[in-house]
Amino acid sequence: SGRGEAETRECIYYNANWELERTNQSGLERCEGEQDKRLHCYASWRNSSGTIELVKKGCWLDDFNCYDRQECVATEENPQVYFCCCEGNFCNERFTHLPEAGGPEVTYEPPPTAPT
């Protein structure tokens, strides 16, 4: 029984490789999936000597390890690309690295959007 799941319909979208892949660079993504399947948001990034380089953000297909995650938290120690997923609209706006070995928690806030 999937109890109390946060339904995901929209995620923050970002693609660092947008020119090569001929997509938008950033925005919102409306999630589409098969009936009865859950949807999630995700974020992926690199950390080069403390400098965060966002790779991609968007919708993520039904994945059991993402169920019931309200926040986007990566736990791998030192991967090439950090990954987190979560449930709930725009839950991937901010993302966190909380290493399993008990290192410091680092949360990455999105830059404030300039007023138009």
Epitope: G2, F64, Y67, D68, E100
Partner: antibody, heavy 118, light 111 residues
């Protein structure tokens, strides 16, 4: 090193109950979904149950629905499978498995044997 | 009821190549089912070989590879060795909390 150690198996009569435990170490248990998989003697693997990181979502194969209950205690790094109204066809080795992103089983325990017989 | 099908048995000569397949009765297997493959020798726990269609698990030799072939998931073993003689299981993630295992393939390495 990731380790999953099942316990609680044994011989039980039809209609009886058992509670299996899976003690996890070597990783942050609360960060990963978990599953139970079983294998009847001389047969193939069969997924039994899965539980999300918080325990808020639980799922079962049809043949055990209403009889088995999966749970987890993240403070004790332990996964459980409460098995009630056991039947002869539940006789199997029960494995616990850690679930990783893209929904695969990346680590397995060594299993515990459950025998249902009169 | 979803049924996942594998060849019940397969034989390969040492050094040869074998491809095991994994299909199901409800249509084509695609990457969205996150097909994964496991090796099991008698009396042992399963060992993870391939996940997410084609990603090798840590420590798995590159003789093992995964793919989608037509409408099925496939596991290919190139340069088969005697200790590859095992049972091989595929698993499909159906979503909504449900996995389905194939019936397994018993691989015999001849000679």
């Amino acid at each position: 090193e990731v380790q999953l150690l099942e316990s609680g198996g044994g011989l039980v009569q039809p209609g009886g109950s058992l509670r299996l435990s899976c003690a996890a170490s070597g990783f942050t248990f609360r960060n990963y979904a978990m599953a139970w998989v079983r294998q009847a003697p001389g047969k193939g693997l069969e997924w039994v149950s899965g539980i999300s990181v918080t325990g808020g979502s639980t799922f079962y194969t049809d043949s055990v629905k209403g009889r088995f209950t999966v749970s987890r205690d993240n403070s004790r790094n332990t996964l459980y499978l409460q098995m009630n109204s056991l039947r002869a066809e539940d006789t199997a080795v029960y494995y616990c498995a850690k679930v990783y992103y893209t929904s695969f089983f990346d680590y397995w325990g060594q299993g515990t044997l459950v025998t249902v017989s009169s | 009821q979803t049924v996942v099908t594998q060849e019940p048995s397969f034989s390969v000569s040492p050094g040869g190549t074998v491809t095991l397949t994994c299909g199901f009765n409800s249509g084509s297997v695609s990457t969205s089912y996150y097909p994964s493959w496991y090796q099991q020798t008698p009396g042992q726990a399963p060992r993870t070989l391939i996940y997410n269609t084609n990603t090798r698990s840590s420590g798995v030799p590159d003789r093992f590879s995964g793919s989608i072939l037509g409408n099925k998931a496939a596991l290919t073993i190139t340069g088969a060795q005697a200790d590859d003689e095992s049972d091989y299981y595929c698993v499909l993630w159906m979503g909504s909390g449900i996995w389905v295992f194939g019936g397994g393939t018993k691989l015999t390495v001849l000679g």
